[in-house]
């Protein structure tokens, strides 16, 4: 008996995220999921922020990228997960 | 240890503004955003809006859009929550909430560590 | 924006009871919730992430089950300091939202 993770109408098992965290599809707004060896990755859309891309930047705040966490390079996706 | 301490109790007009901080010690504070939470008295717990304390980008409930300003300083590690135009519905205790890694992690364990809280009363 | 209901709003139950509180959002969250135990005048306190896993230090006698719009928090066998206020937040989603509480009090 498998918990399972929902997201978009689709249940993924906890072996399938194993395998393939990006199964689960969780980065946001037009994110993209990249497996990582923590992990997984999103690469937010520019105006948005947040590990999974789920807030809007707000426009008068300072630049909608964040930066780099050790380890990545600026530009180089957030790691998720 | 990890700790949030917040400023003291503001009393204000309605109409005025008022700064609240939170200063963050015994981790990297560029590293984990950092959200406002909200309680008014005999309530329940209201999100307000989040700051990336590495870049300075924030988001805000569509609440607060407009009379809500968060920043952060790095060189003190502290963040802070403006709120403008208050009302006498704004009387509550306002709470800083460590959140996710800004780098991510395995897990999320956010809002994991809140600050003391601040009261902050409006009234004429 | 995504609406967290929880219940009961209040319930009471004595020491060493087992006591289930219910959260349901208005929309698919995944696994992405949290538990929150608020005392009067305190700090809410983190017990639960991740809908199911236990923050460090917290006793095992509560737990955290379900997955996409249902979801529970259990304690198995309540204690004095149990009683408390107990709050649902979802993080998948922008706002993130909170349920109304579920006040926990002495029969």
């Known amino acids: 008996d498998h918990h399972h993770h929902h997201h978009e109408q689709k249940l993924i098992s906890e072996e399938d995220l194993r395998a393939d965290p990006c199964a689960a599809r969780p980065c946001a707004h037009g994110g993209r999921c990249y497996a990582h060896f923590s992990g997984l990755v999103c690469a937010c859309a520019p105006g948005y922020m947040g590990a999974r891309c789920e807030f809007p930047v707000h426009p008068d705040g300072a630049s909608a990228l964040p930066a780099a966490p050790p380890g990545l390079r600026p530009g180089d996706p957030q790691r998720y997960l | 240890q990890v700790q949030l301490v917040q400023s003291g109790a503001e009393v204000k007009k309605p109409g005025a503004s008022v700064k609240v901080s939170c200063k963050a010690s015994?981790?990297?504070?560029?590293?984990?955003?950092m959200h406002w939470v909200r309680q008014a008295p005999g309530q329940g717990l209201e999100w307000m809006g989040i700051i990336n304390p590495s870049g300075g980008s924030t988001s805000y409930a569509q609440k607060f859009q407009g009379r809500v300003t968060m920043t952060r300083d790095t060189s003190t590690s502290t963040v802070y929550m403006e709120l403008s135009s208050l009302r006498s519905e704004d009387t509550a205790v306002y709470y800083c909430?460590?959140?996710?890694?800004?780098?991510?992690?395995?897990?999320?364990?956010?809002?994991?560590?809140w600050g003391q809280g601040t009261t902050v009363t409006v009234s004429s | 924006d995504i609406q967290m209901t929880q219940s009961p709003s209040a319930m009471s139950a004595s020491v060493g009871d087992r006591v289930t509180i219910t959260c349901r959002a208005s929309?698919?969250?995944?696994?992405?919730l949290a538990w929150f135990q608020q005392k009067p005048g305190k700090v809410p306190e983190p017990l639960i992430y991740a809908a199911s896993s236990l923050q460090s230090g917290v006793p095992s006698r509560f737990s955290g089950s379900g997955s996409v719009t249902e979801f529970t928090l259990t304690i198995s066998s309540l204690q004095p300091e149990d009683f408390a206020t107990y709050y649902c937040?979802?993080?998948?989603?922008?706002?993130?939202?909170f349920g109304q509480g579920t006040k926990l009090e002495i029969k």
């Open positions: 929309q698919g969250i995944s696994n992405y």
């Open positions: 937040l979802q993080h998948n989603s922008s706002p993130y939202t």
């Open positions: 015994g981790y990297t504070f560029t590293s984990y955003y």
């Open positions: 909430a460590r959140g996710e890694a800004v780098g991510g992690n395995y897990y999320y364990y956010g809002m994991d560590v």
